[in-house]
Structures are given as C-alpha cells and as structure tokens.
C-alpha cells in the first residue's frame, strides 16, 4: 500500500560569507517568473559545487528564500531579486524556508489537521 506524502515546513536563518566566486547558488521565481503556481517567491534552483553555500551545507535546492539581510523578497521582479543578492555585501543573512517531504501512513488514514479532507 502506498503512503501519503506530506511536507514539513521549517524556517532557518543562514549566514553566509561571500567567497571568491560569490555565494554560489542560482535562483528562480519572482512576480514575472513564477516557478510555483500562484507563488511569486524566490527559490533556490542550484547549489554550485565548492561555492560558499555548498561549503556551508545548510541551503538546499528547492528552499524558498524569504529575505536577504532582513529585506523581504515578496513581490519582486526576478531581476530585482537577483540584483539584491549581488549587492548584498560580504556577509549575507538569508531567511529560508525548507520544505521536507515526509512519508506518512497508508492512504485512507488521515491524521489530525490534514488539509486534504
């Protein structure tokens, strides 16, 4: 019997120090480039090998970045978000949302607070 897939959403503050080749990741999203339907948020699409983010180890592909150095990333054009990262300075503080896939019990068993009912 197949299990039901749910998601555990957590938030984390990640402080990165810009390396010789920068922060070392790619982003998708923005009001003009929605990656997730009905969500103009900014998502991590690539972690570059041996870059600052990869060496730190906490930022993951698929994470949603909520803010950079305290500046909210809501309702930004894609290029404006890119520019914000590029101009963020040497020490960069990211507020990120991790979405971890978790396997629950068999289909048909709904736990408390399950939105699918």
């Amino acid at each position: 019997m197949n299990g039901r897939v749910d998601y555990l959403v957590t938030e984390e503050e990640i402080n990165l120090t810009r390396g010789p080749s920068g922060l070392g990741f790619n982003i998708v999203g923005g009001t003009d480039q929605q990656y997730v339907s009905n969500d103009s948020g900014i998502y991590v699409s690539r972690i570059k090998e041996n870059g600052a983010a990869a060496l730190d180890g906490r930022l993951q592909e698929g994470d949603k970045i909520l803010s950079v150095n305290g500046q909210d990333l809501k309702n930004l054009l894609h290029q404006d978000a890119v520019d914000l990262f590029r101009n963020a300075g040497y020490a960069v503080s990211l507020r990120v949302q991790h979405r971890l896939q978790v396997q629950n019990g068999p289909i048909g068993h709904r736990g408390e607070g399950d939105p699918s009912g």
Epitope: V28, Y43, R46, K48, E49, E61, Q79, F85
Partner: nanobody, 128 residues
C-alpha cells in the same frame, strides 16, 4: 540527485535522422537547464546543444546549427535532440546533462558554458 537516462542512439546512414531522448528523475525537471554533449573518438567531450529551464533560450555548436534541434517536454520530464542530415563526423557517444537553472546570484554566464551537475551514461550514435 538527478538521474538521467538516454535512449534513441543507433546506426544510421549519412543524411539520415535520429531522435535522442533523455528522461530525468529525482528532482523537479522544470527547474533544470538541460544539455546534450558528445564525445567523438579520441576527442574531448563537447557541448552540442543546451536549453534553459524555461525553454526560451537555446545554444548550438556551430557545426550542428540548422541540423540539430533541442527541445523539452516538462510534462514528460524529457529533453530531446532531433538530429537531421547526419554526417560521419557526428559519430560519437552522446551524453545528456543537467544543472539547476535560473539566474546565478553571483554573475552572468554564457548559455554555451554549460557546467553540468549531472550526467547520463551516454548513447552511441554511429553514422556510416
């Protein structure tokens, strides 16, 4: 991690056509830039064609322009390389490649400079 499985290679006569397919799994395909590389006997592995995650930007090696077409089907998690007017010098092992798409937060890079994060096992194309 991303798993890439190529298919569609084979033996074809000069002037003929082949269509290579690469099925991807392991993470959302729609956020991946995809590419095709080839390694000819005794040569380096070269980028042949790339397509970005949105499908609106492509790159081709000069020697295949007008003959090869790269395309993607996000619903099927697959990238294709349509190869027409094949020549004996197109004989090679063809590899599917993938990397996370989007914009680098550090600097621009040329779409032809395709640093792959993931590779397929390759499929042999022989043009006689």
């Amino acid at each position: 991690d991303v798993q890439l499985v190529e298919s569609g290679g084979g033996l074809v006569q000069a002037g003929g056509s082949l269509r290579l397919s690469c099925a991807a799994s392991g993470r959302p395909f729609s956020s991946l830039d995809m590419g095709w590389f080839r390694q000819r006997p005794g040569k380096e592995r070269d980028v042949v064609a790339t397509i970005n995650w949105t499908g609106d930007s492509t790159y081709y090696l000069d020697s295949v322009k007008g003959r090869f077409t790269i395309s993607r089907d996000n619903a099927k998690n697959t990238v294709f390389l349509q190869m027409n007017s094949l020549k004996p010098e197109d004989t090679a092992v063809y590899y599917c490649a993938a990397r996370g798409g989007g914009s680098s937060v550090d600097s621009e890079y040329d779409v032809g400079e395709f640093e792959s994060d993931y590779w397929g096992q390759g499929t042999q194309v022989t043009v006689s």
